[in-house]
Amino acid sequence: LPAQVAFTPYAPEPGGTCRLREYYDQTAQMCCSKCPPGQHAKVFCTKTSDTVCDSCEDSTYTQLWNWVPECLSCGSRCSSDQVETQACTREQNRICTCRPGWYCALSKQEGCRLCAQLRKCRPGFGVARPGTETSDVVCKPCAPGTFSNTTSSTDICRPHQICHVVAIPGNASMDAVCTSTSPTRSMAPGAVHLPQPVSTRSQHTQPTPAPSTAPGTSFLLPVGPSPPAEGSTGD
């Protein structure tokens, strides 16, 4: 670092402002130094002496240049349905985000205050809109010709298999059952899974949209923590 030149508070030009990382102290009527992140003002400046800064205590922080008399307290420890994505340090608050399979029902400035488990669509219903970090799964009834036989927060409605001869017709919660001759499918067999939302601040999954339903067959369920609605399970 270059040779230190001690800062002396100064009166700003008439109509002027203090420099960046300085503040105007109303009592001293001078431009004085702000304290850097991780520190706070221990002693405020006077006309002849600059701000005296001190490090933040454990479990407290300041994220910005400041002249606060006390550092801010870090948030409480993350709850069991959350993961700590940023630890509490002298320069940053703890950040808690929801773990996989959960979404943030009540967010705060950074991270999440309250997590809720993602809704599971019951048999006969598939995922119309997948869950994200901040929104719940939306279920829809399976349209004619499609079914879902699972209780899942990721499975969409799949087409019935097409039989040469149908033994048991399919319905919204069950695939068609064919006689012994081999069936064909309008789509590849096997459940289609939508990705779980990623519980980090930097990644956002872009799941592929579910196949559109017949007109008038989709409906939306309320987003956010709510009693189990039709088509969803409350576990």
């Epitope: 230190q4 030149v5 100064y10 960046l20 990382r21 600059d50």
Partner: antibody, heavy 123, light 107 residues
């Protein structure tokens, strides 16, 4: 090593706006203020304004308050300056420069400069 | 605004000579003054800060002096690579202001 890489020369029409960029590397971008300076043969070096990338706080020379707007993007370590309502008077070389200014010191000199962006305003 | 005046626009000197560039502030700026060297087609480079502290990258033939309103940049044993324009700058208060520059010409 510290480098400030500025965007290329611009030729623009009067009345238009332009945004110049300054990408920083070799140091922690948010630790230092970024300042912008204009240079012309007639007026020499003129301080336009500055930004603290950590907070987004800005300061301007009154002369350029309605002309320039400085911003910074911490994620890409890039500072920007938008110049509005351009006239031939705005034709100049514009520099971004890092300020050494730090707590407890009156030091505030410019230790690293970009290579400059030449702006020509012409119809 | 604080006006920084460099009264000499050009100064002529010879290799090996000593030359002094002056700068006057319109009001007291303490020692909050820096000197920059700018060679043709290049960006400015800091040579002196806080009126008298030599920047780490500057040759030791460059010295600065002064406080309050009168400042001097002295180049001892001038070299051909010192051919450049020199600017003073005050950083006491916003808006930061520069002198008009003094071009050093080598005879």
């Amino acid at each position: 090593q510290v480098q400030l890489q500025q965007s290329g020369a611009e030729v623009v029409r009067p009345g238009a706006s332009v945004t110049l960029s300054c990408k920083a590397s070799g140091y922690t971008f948010s630790d230092y203020e970024m300042h912008w300076v204009k240079q012309t043969p007639v007026h020499g070096l003129e301080w336009i304004g500055a930004i603290d990338p950590e907070t987004g706080d800005t300061a301007y020379n009154q002369k350029f308050k309605d002309k320039a707007r400085v911003t910074a993007d911490k994620s890409s370590s890039t500072a920007y300056m938008e110049l509005r309502s351009l006239t031939s008077e705005d034709s100049a070389v514009y520099y971004c420069t890092r300020d050494i200014h730090y707590y407890g010191s009156s030091l505030s000199y410019f230790d690293y400069w970009g290579q400059g962006t030449t702006l020509t305003v012409s119809s | 605004d604080i006006v920084m005046t460099q009264s000499q626009k050009f100064m002529s000197t010879s290799v090996g000579d000593r030359v002094s560039v002056t700068c006057k502030a319109s009001q007291n700026v303490g020692t909050n003054v820096a000197w920059y060297q700018q060679k043709p087609g290049q960006s400015p480079k800091v040579m002196i800060y806080s009126a008298s502290y030599r920047y780490s990258g500057a040759p030791d033939r460059f010295t600065g002096s002064g406080s309050g309103t009168d400042f001097t940049l002295t180049v001892n044993n001038v070299q051909s690579e010192d051919l450049a324009e020199y600017f003073c700058q005050q950083y006491k208060t916003y808006p930061y202001t520069f002198g008009g520059g003094t071009k050093l010409e080598i005879e």
